[in-house]
Interface confidence: low
């Protein structure tokens, strides 16, 4: 009996972690990335009249709980950390398009949801509207990749998320990304990489 776990692309980047979703004994989604969330929140000024907007920097820390589900055309990664004070959900969809050369399938990141608790004291100091908030992406189409390939991008990418905390926008910063939410052929092994344009340019410059 053999259970081969061949995690590719490992590095010593202290911010990065690997997230794996398994179904029916095999890997169906793999994601390796570092993520940070810039979260604005209001605090009372010392006069208790004015509101001041502070900023919490929340890193996705190692040791997070990983869940998810896989499907033919939709896959989801869920990551929970700091005793579930924070939760990240990433929804991936696979679509077929009619091109001049014929049908062409791609997958993309179609939705991001970040749930945070501004009553969590290590990141938020006396937030006025302390409690659970949800920040969602709007009409997202990111990390677009040909079907059967993994997406790789070392460069930083930002995604804006509209928060349920009124008039607040959360910024998600992704870096050192390597993701494959569909069509994993071999257990724990990424397929051929589709590199982001920034990384492609850097390779040409080298």
């Amino acid at each position: 009996e053999q259970e081969v776990e061949n995690l590719s692309g490992l590095s010593t980047n202290p911010e990065k972690d690997i997230f794996v979703v398994r179904e029916n004994g095999t890997t169906c989604l793999m994601a390796e990335f570092a993520a940070k969330f810039i979260v604005p929140y209001d605090v009372w000024a010392s006069n208790y009249v004015d509101l001041i907007t502070e900023q919490a920097d929340i890193a996705l820390t190692r040791g997070a709980e990983v869940k998810g589900r896989c499907g033919h055309s939709q896959s989801e990664l869920q990551v929970f950390w700091v005793d579930r004070a924070y939760a990240l959900k990433m929804l991936f969809v696979k679509e077929s398009h009619n091109m001049s050369k014929g049908p062409e399938a791609t997958w993309r990141l179609s939705k991001v949801q970040f749930v945070y608790d501004s009553s969590e004291k290590t990141h938020f100091k006396d937030a006025v509207s302390a409690g659970k908030h949800t920040a969602n992406s709007h009409h997202l189409s990111a990390l677009v990749t040909p079907a059967g390939k993994s997406y790789e991008c070392q460069a930083q990418q930002t995604i804006s998320l509209a928060s349920s905390d009124p008039q607040k926008t959360v910024t998600m910063i992704l870096s050192a990304v390597h993701i494959q939410p569909f069509d994993i052929i071999s257990d724990f092994v990424f397929s051929e990489e589709h590199k982001c344009p920034v990384d492609e340019r850097e390779q040409l410059e080298e």
């Epitope: 009996e1 053999q2 259970e3 081969v4 776990e5 061949n6 995690l7 490992l10 590095s11 010593t12 690997i18 794996v20 398994r22 179904e23 029916n24 004994g25 040791g63 709980e65 990983v66 869940k67 724990f188």
Partner: antibody, heavy 119, light 106 residues
Framework: EVKLEESGGGLVQPGGSMKLSCTAS????????MDWVRQSPEKGLEWVAE??????????YYAESVKGRFTISRDDSKSSVYLQMNSLRTEDTAIYYC??????????WGQGTSVTVSS | QIVLTQSPAIMSASPGEKVTITCTAS?????MHWFQQKPGTSPKLWIY???YLASGVPTRFSGSGSGTSYSLTISRMEAEDAATYYC?????????FGGGTNLEIK
Amino acid sequence: EVKLEESGGGLVQPGGSMKLSCTASGFTFSDAWMDWVRQSPEKGLEWVAEIRGKADNHATYYAESVKGRFTISRDDSKSSVYLQMNSLRTEDTAIYYCIPYYRYAMDYWGQGTSVTVSS
Amino acid sequence: QIVLTQSPAIMSASPGEKVTITCTASSSVSYMHWFQQKPGTSPKLWIYATSYLASGVPTRFSGSGSGTSYSLTISRMEAEDAATYYCQQKSNYPWTFGGGTNLEIK
């Protein structure tokens, strides 16, 4: 916070039986693969058995040295994993640890329970 | 089964010294985990998936390797690093551990 509590160890005669229990908390137990690992001065750290999560139909795996003698089982409703040990031998003497393998490695270890097989 | 051979079995290092512990597998493995154990305590996951530091592990530790050859390195030895370190593979059943390296402080 992840907590693991092993129990059921003690002194048993060669050929005897013993059942170890482990109660876990602080993570989604039904998703976790659970391992038993033992440690003795003679053999060092030795993996004993593994039972996978619900998604993997609770598949079980054993070390050759315990196959046919030990049985691993779990009760997800009680967040517990068990190791039924039969036909015990003196070389089974060790500290037994139950460990969740719910990410990529043996992330958390309890204090272990001591098993002594001696006449 | 895959046999993991650690070397050296016992070593001592002075504070500030660079330390490297190696783990050689009898056949190729996908990646290696490392555990730290101090007397009278349970082992602790120290490095997982070859190069990832477990939570709370000082950044002076690093892990590297591939195939049959893996290593754990401490860039500058400190007194609190004195412990026994074990490598472990979870690529092929049965999961196996190395015999351990007992690292002492001079």
